[in-house]
Interface confidence: medium
């Protein structure tokens, strides 16, 4: 392990489209990748009239936008679909929305996906 870096070995997995994509609906996903690459977790969700609807969660390949982010935070202002990535085991278990240049309450993840 590299000092000061939180290595990602597994992430929370969720796929709303699990039947068509032929995956589990929910679980823990081991993250694979080349040894010289960093690995991350991600989460994507929608906010439909204040209700959080998770789209996907899982492992994410080496991406500079995710480096050294211990928390999964979306910073884009009012995206259609929210996306965040982070480093560290299961760091995508909780995710939040903090748009840059605005003071807004975070949207935490209150949803526990039901097993299939």
């Amino acid at each position: 392990a590299i000092l000061g870096r939180s290595e990602t070995q597994e992430c929370l997995f969720f796929n709303a489209n699990w039947e068509k994509d032929r995956t589990n609906q929910t679980g823990v996903e081991p993250c694979y990748g080349d040894k010289d690459k960093r690995r991350h977790c991600f989460a994507t969700w929608k906010n439909i009239s204040g209700s959080i609807e998770i789209v996907k969660q899982g492992c994410w390949l080496d991406d500079i936008n995710c480096y050294d982010r211990t928390d999964c935070v979306e910073k884009k202002d009012s995206p259609e679909v929210y996306f965040c990535c982070c480093e560290g085991n299961m760091c995508n278990e909780k995710f939040s929305y903090f748009p840059e240049m605005e003071v807004t309450q975070p949207t935490s993840n209150p949803v526990t996906p039901k097993p299939p």
């Epitope: 796929n15 489209n17 068509k20 994509d21 032929r22 995956t23 996903e29 993250c31 694979y32 990748g33 080349d34 994507t44 996907k56 899982g58 492992c59 994410w60 390949l61 991406d63 500079i64 936008n65 259609e80 679909v81 996306f83």
Partner: antibody, heavy 120, light 107 residues
Framework: EVQLLESGGGLVQPGGSLRLSCAAS????????MNWVRQAPGKGLEWVAG????????SYADSVKGRFTISRDNSKNTLYLQMNSLRAEDTAVYYC?????????????WGQGTLVTVSS | DIQMTQSPSSLSASVGDRVTITCRAS??????VNWYQQKPGKAPKLVIY???SRASGVPSRFSGSGSGTDFTLTISSLQPEDFATYYC?????????FGGGTKVEIK
């Protein structure tokens, strides 16, 4: 060095069968999902089928569903594509390609391809 | 299935030119887009993944941008070895789907 080497292509008559193989080396084969992608002569790329790291999940393009079967033998570091009821439109170069996760990831290494020609 | 529409289908450019290729998805795919380079008789090679990340060994003149439905591959200063066909691909949902390709030819 990651290497993927396809074999098994050739000339086959319509309605016939063929089994393609992809021998993998230079990485931990059993940790990666694998895919078959084809390219008809002078045309673009078409994803054919995918299989997750342990063979637990498979998925197919509608154009080959029910005719093609993807499988893998992790003890032999080999990926397979069994092609039955072949049609002229299946004529293409078939590539095997690696992906880190079963879903939402790039095809980061490709083999050199093997040509399948379906003709009478 | 998610359709990926690439434009232009071909373009002519000179060494040193800035080249931009666009790809539009039929629905939002967030950052789940990848770009490949293919030379005649060769296998495709990954150039950009996750919309903006350069694959190993890819020169810095290649960059990717976009999210949602609109994506761009840019070659800042075209080199002789860059003349090839480029494909976008979505990995948001199965089946994986590719754009029709953009052939970059020498002017």
């Amino acid at each position: 060095e990651v290497q993927l080497l396809e074999s098994g292509g050739g000339l086959v008559q319509p309605g016939g069968s063929l089994r393609l193989s992809c021998a993998a080396s230079g990485f931990t084969f059993s940790s990666y999902s694998m895919n078959w992608v084809r390219q008809a002569p002078g045309k673009g790329l078409e994803w054919v089928a995918g299989i997750n790291y342990n063979g637990g999940y498979t998925s197919y393009a509608d154009s080959v569903k029910g005719r093609f079967t993807i499988s893998r033998d992790n003890s032999k570091n080999t990926l397979y594509l069994q092609m039955n009821s072949l049609r002229a439109e299946d004529t293409a170069v078939y590539y095997c390609a690696r992906s880190a996760n079963w879903h939402d990831t790039a095809l980061d290494y490709w083999g050199q391809g093997t040509l399948v020609t379906v003709s009478s | 299935d998610i359709q990926m529409t690439q434009s232009p289908s071909s373009l002519s450019a000179s060494v040193g030119d800035r080249v931009t290729i666009t790809c539009r998805a039929s629905q939002s795919i967030l950052s789940f887009v990848n770009w490949y380079q293919q030379k005649p008789g060769k296998a495709p090679k990954l150039v950009i993944y996750a919309a903006t990340s350069r694959a190993s060994g890819v020169p810095s003149r290649f960059s990717g941008s976009g999210s949602g439905t609109d994506f761009t591959l840019t070659i800042s200063s075209l080199q002789p070895e860059d003349f090839a066909t480029y494909y976008c691909q979505q990995s948001y949902n199965l089946p994986l789907t590719f754009g029709g390709g953009t052939k970059v030819e020498i002017k």
